[in-house]
Amino acid sequence: DGNTTRTPETNGSLCGAPGENCTGTTPRQKVKTHFSRCPKQYKHYCIHGRCRFVVDEQTPSCICEKGYFGARCERVDLFY
């Protein structure tokens, strides 16, 4: 388990509903977000990265390997 800071959605929502996929990037305020190990069913969710489970949202997110981006780390960064 761990935690980090992240920014809310641009509409001010804290993305707290179970199942929501939060992708906002516009800073508003720093929010402490806690993570846990991803459920086994998401083992293959992150293609080029590591899966983590956002506790408040109860949804997986990915930490991408260098050179990859996208919700599932599925896109190659051609400028990397």
């Epitope: 509903a17 179970p18 199942g19 929501e20 996929n21 939060c22 992708t23 846990s36 190990r37 459920p39 086994k40 069913q41 293959h44 969710y45 506790v55 109860q58 949804t59 919700a71 599932r72 599925e74």
Partner: antibody
């Protein structure tokens, strides 16, 4: 307010096909995972399938794998379930529900009856 | 597959009673467990997620506890609107529900 409205249910013969739809409103559909969950008459709940927000990550229950296909159209705020090779044991109320792991909002359900 | 076993399958209780429903997973699921309430002819309603977190808008008389394989839903003081069927659901491996516990009026 969040609304999920299923349609497309009905009576179909064994071996037949049916396509269910779920129209979503009241939330940003493209940001959420969505699932199908079913309930046979007088029985418990059974998760059927989910699809992630982008439509690229999908899972199915073993009981429907290879016969059912989940999909979504984020431009239309609509979820689909294509059901092929239907069996009597697929008879159930089919709910669409918001979320992939947990289901915080549900539709009212649509009844699928598979019978000859 | 992970099997979820609820007990009891049904129970009779009176308004004001403390009610406890248990759910056992066939293998460890950490805290990846939810609880739902369903009334006849209606869709289920999420009560508890992550084993012990109360879903927004759910009365505080509902609480959840447990981790690993053994989990509990407690209603501290049963209200008339609480007579319903309750389901647990694990979401570590692919989602599976318990068979349900029907709470009836004594």
């Amino acid at each position: 307010q969040v609304q999920l409205l299923e349609s497309g249910g009905g009576l179909v013969q064994p071996g037949g096909s049916l396509r269910l739809s779920c129209a979503a409103s009241g939330f940003t559909f493209s940001r959420y995972w969505i699932s199908w969950v079913r309930q046979a008459p007088g029985k418990g709940l059974e998760w059927v399938s989910y699809i992630d927000s982008t439509g690229t990550f999908i899972n199915y229950a073993d009981s429907v794998k290879g016969r059912f296909t989940i999909s979504r159209d984020n431009s239309k705020n609509t979820l689909y379930l294509q059901m092929n090779s239907l069996r009597a044991e697929d008879t159930a109320v089919y709910y669409c529900a918001r979320g992939g792991s947990l289901f915080d909002y549900w539709g009212q359900g649509t009844l699928v009856t598979v019978s000859s | 597959d992970i099997q979820m076993t609820q007990s009891p399958s049904s129970l009779s209780a009176s308004v004001g009673d403390r009610v406890t429903i248990t759910c056992r997973a066939s293998q460890g699921i950490i805290s990846y467990l939810g609880w739902y309430q369903q009334k006849p002819g209606k869709a289920p309603k999420l009560l508890i997620y992550a084993a012990s977190s109360l879903q927004s808008g759910v009365p505080s008389r509902f609480s959840g506890s447990g981790s690993g394989t053994d989990f509990t839903l407690t209603i501290s003081s049963l209200q008339p609107e609480d007579f319903a069927t309750y389901y647990c659901q694990q979401y570590d491996a692919l989602n599976t529900f318990g068979q349900g516990t029907k709470v009836e009026i004594k």
